[in-house]
């Protein structure tokens, strides 16, 4: 019989008492084969973290800073359930740490040196740890003691709870630095008042502080937020302009064998029976013998943290950077304006080899990081292990939802000013063999399909989006008799046609021979009835242009396109016979790397781009003999985006809407995780 006991860790007598009450009340409402609670008492949260790691306990609820400690080796714990605040309809699991300034003050984030600062309190998250952690490497050396470095960075501060004797500058704006509400500038509202009164130039608070203190929009409009990219935004745009997004209170468990489903089952049932306004005799979110025992008193309920989400992703790049800076105190030697090498993310060993050659030829400007799937690469860029990669539009959408930004677009047509003119896009098409003359768009049911990969534009999002509108369900593996759609579940009929061997079967990378544009076309040639690819795929792999044995004798005339009106047309008539226009592939990165990725890639394409004529002996960035490694092989240049510099603007309203409609069919665990952070 599986053990269905969750051992909850308590850190005080009062918590232990509440835990026992929790245990007893759960027993009375949950069947005997359901989850149960046991209580383990430890002296501190860190002891609880160690106990969970050692399998002596299973769960504890932690603030963000402790979630970071819990994630560090050797603990390796992960977030499994989040408390939420506000309403069930609009649950808030995170808050945003922001830097608020007066509208007319005219300085940016990188110009804070010498300004006057207002903090909620020494050692507090939004008011100290996050801003000072992010500014850490700009502080004057020596950076220890930290308070002295901060005092020397700002021209005056109010940092309640600081030692006013040793660091008088930190108490300059609030004499005495009182550590309670007796100090008018203490806490969130106090720090904001410090700014409002004109004592300070910037207040480090949370996003809701401004709304709680200024009910009137006209008053709020006198303030702005400082963004990390050295711009400013209105105070209601905090989701796009903050120092960090911070989880409020989170249940953590072991990463392996952590009982995460059982913990969720327990807490979900607990909130049903003992959540807000549910029961008089026991309340989960109430602490008669103290404050915030086991859970925050202000919590309204629990949400399951998506399984793909590890602590790094949950806490977010900015928060992890800030806390790591404070904890480790390491900075690059003498910060320079020069860009660090760009860490390119390569999929599987084929791309890695090309990336390595690029790295050698770039003489250190490019470094390479490997991952097995596109989503793993996106996650690595999010958490700073990698910096950039070029993505199909479908993955630009996921990357955008995960907070990444497009920085340059692949262009596929030769033009005089290629780098200045991003193209409108390419065509997504459905290709069939000319010999299968009865096949049309209207009778694809039961046929064998070939896709570039799940989640990609021409191979999946566009054809499956159109199909979804027709069949109104997501069971595409039932619609087609079989197929190859790399990235599908291995037991799906949409992996049946794939050719990868062993564990590589149906993998969304080049280890699966039917992956990508060329792979999907090969699937059609060898096994399938229809391939969903781009308009250039057939000409690029016929007429001897692809020397591989399967392709070398193919003729473009032996293939036709399916048109949406039920007719068919020759391959060259793609402009009048396509499924939709697709946004070009684009390079994505984190916002903080945008300028450097842009600069280095433009240098790199001048060295190794289409201007290189002999690719047999020289490195060519946009060539890999039809394998589309790192970039599409038909890329002519990487073009500036001008004002299309967000994923929504880049992809366009129509495509974003189409992918959004298909979201209900999404199997993307990364998309699920990212929309948890930003619904």
């Amino acid at each position: 019989v599986p053990d269905k006991t969750v051992r909850w860790c308590a850190v005080s007598e009062h918590e232990a008492t509440k835990c026992q009450s929790f245990r007893d009340h759960m027993k009375s409402v949950i069947p005997s084969d359901g989850p149960s609670v046991a209580c383990v008492k430890k002296a501190s949260y860190l002891d609880c973290i160690r106990a969970i790691a050692a399998n002596e306990a299973d769960a504890v609820t932690l603030d963000a800073g402790l979630v970071y400690d819990a994630y560090l080796a050797p603990n390796n714990l992960k977030p499994v359930v989040a408390e939420f605040y506000g309403s069930k309809e609009d649950p808030q699991t995170f808050y945003y740490a922001v830097a608020v300034v007066k509208k007319d003050s005219g300085f940016q984030m990188n110009q804070l040196r010498g300004k006057k600062s207002c903090h909620t309190g020494l050692g507090r998250s939004a008011g100290w740890n996050i801003p000072i952690g992010l500014l850490y490497c700009d502080l004057p050396e020596p950076r220890k003691p930290l308070e002295k470095a901060v005092a020397n960075f700002f021209s005056g501060s109010c940092a309640p709870c600081a030692d006013g004797t040793d660091f008088p500058q930190l108490c300059q704006l609030c004499p005495g630095c009182g550590c309670s509400t007796l100090n008018q500038y203490f806490g969130y509202s106090g720090a904001f008042k410090c700014l409002k009164d004109g004592a300070g130039d910037v207040a480090f608070v949370k996003h809701s502080t401004i709304f709680e203190n200024l009910a009137n929009k006209a008053d709020r409009d006198q303030y702005e937020l400082l963004c990390l990219d050295n711009t400013r935004k209105p105070v209601d745009e905090y989701k796009d302009c903050h120092l960090a997004q911070v989880p409020s209170h989170t249940v953590v468990a072991r990463s392996m064998g952590g009982k995460e489903d059982l913990i969720w089952e327990l807490l979900n049932q607990a909130q049903e029976h003992f959540g807000k306004d549910k029961s008089k005799e026991f309340q989960l979110f109430s602490s008669p013998h103290g404050k915030d025992l086991l859970f925050k008193d202000s919590a309204h309920g629990f949400l399951k943290v998506p399984p793909r989400m590890d602590a790094k992703m949950y806490l977010g790049y900015e928060y992890v950077t800030a806390i790591r800076n404070l904890r480790e105190g390491t900075c690059p030697e003498a910060p320079t304006d020069e860009c660090k090498p760009v860490k390119w993310c390569a999929l599987s060993h084929h791309e890695r080899l090309k990336c390595d050659e690029w790295s050698v030829n770039s003489v250190g400007k490019i470094e390479c990081v490997s991952a097995e799937t596109t989503e793993d690469c996106i996650a690595k860029i999010m958490n700073g292990e990698a910096d950039a990669m070029s993505l199909d539009g479908g993955f630009v959408y996921i990357a955008g939802k995960c907070g990444l930004v497009p920085v340059l677009a692949e262009n596929y047509n030769k033009s005089d000013n290629c780098e200045d003119t991003p193209e409108a896009g390419y065509f997504a098409i459905a290709v069939v063999k000319k010999s299968a003359s009865d096949l049309t768009w209207d009778n694809l049911k039961g046929k064998k399909s070939c896709h570039t990969a799940v989640g990609r534009t021409a191979g999946w999002n566009i054809p499956m989006g159109l199909l979804y509108n027709k069949i109104n369900h997501c069971r595409f593996d039932e619609f087609f008799s079989e197929g190859c759609a790399p990235g599908s579940k291995k037991d799906s009929s949409l992996c049946k046609l794939c050719m990868g061997s062993g564990l590589n079967l149906c993998e969304p990378n080049n280890k699966e021979g039917y992956y990508g544009y060329t792979g999907a076309f090969r699937c059609l040639v060898e096994k399938g009835d229809v391939a969903f690819v781009k308009h250039q795929t057939v000409p690029q792999n016929t007429g001897g242009k692809n020397p591989d044995p399967w392709a070398k004798n193919l003729n473009e005339k032996d293939y036709e396109l399916l048109c949406l009106d039920g007719t068919r047309k020759p391959v060259e008539e793609y402009a009048n016979c396509h499924l939709a226009r697709a946004p070009n592939h684009a390079v994505v990165t984190r916002k903080d790397k945008e300028a450097c990725v842009h600069k280095i890639l433009r240098q790199q394409q001048h060295l190794f781009g289409s201007n290189v004529t002999d690719c047999s002996g020289n490195f060519c960035l946009f060539r890999s003999e039809t394998k589309d490694l790192l970039f599409r092989d038909d890329t002519v240049c990487l073009a500036k985006l001008h004002d299309r510099n967000t994923y929504e603007k880049y992809l366009g309203e129509e495509y974003v809407k189409a992918v959004g409609n298909l979201r209900k069919c999404s199997t993307s665990s990364l998309l699920e995780a990212c929309t948890f952070r930003r619904p």
């Epitope: 084929h350 047999s616 020289n618 890999s624």
Partner: nanobody, 117 residues
Amino acid sequence: QVQLVESGGGLVQPGGSLRLSCAASGSIFSIATMAWYRQAPGKQRELVAGITRSGSTNYRDSVKGRFTISRDNAKNTMYLQMNSLKPEDTAVYYCTDYSSRYYHDYWGQGTQVTVSS
């Protein structure tokens, strides 16, 4: 397919030196980017050092200042001079020429380097 044969490995004490050679058959050598990789037991194969046709070199951080890559186009040979060797340099070392454009799964036998006291 260019044939590449690695040699020069062996057992050496920490702090010692070795010089690896990679002999290539085929005319591609003089124009290709060349590189040394290594693979330790249970680890992924990793790029150690590379050299372009024009002689520009690049090294992984952990070997910078200790290893030197060079090539002799007349002899169709590439070298890796390894000084101040450390136990963590223990691996099988392979050379590659990138001429088959990335999607080959061909690697030579490699040459074993063991750094141990």
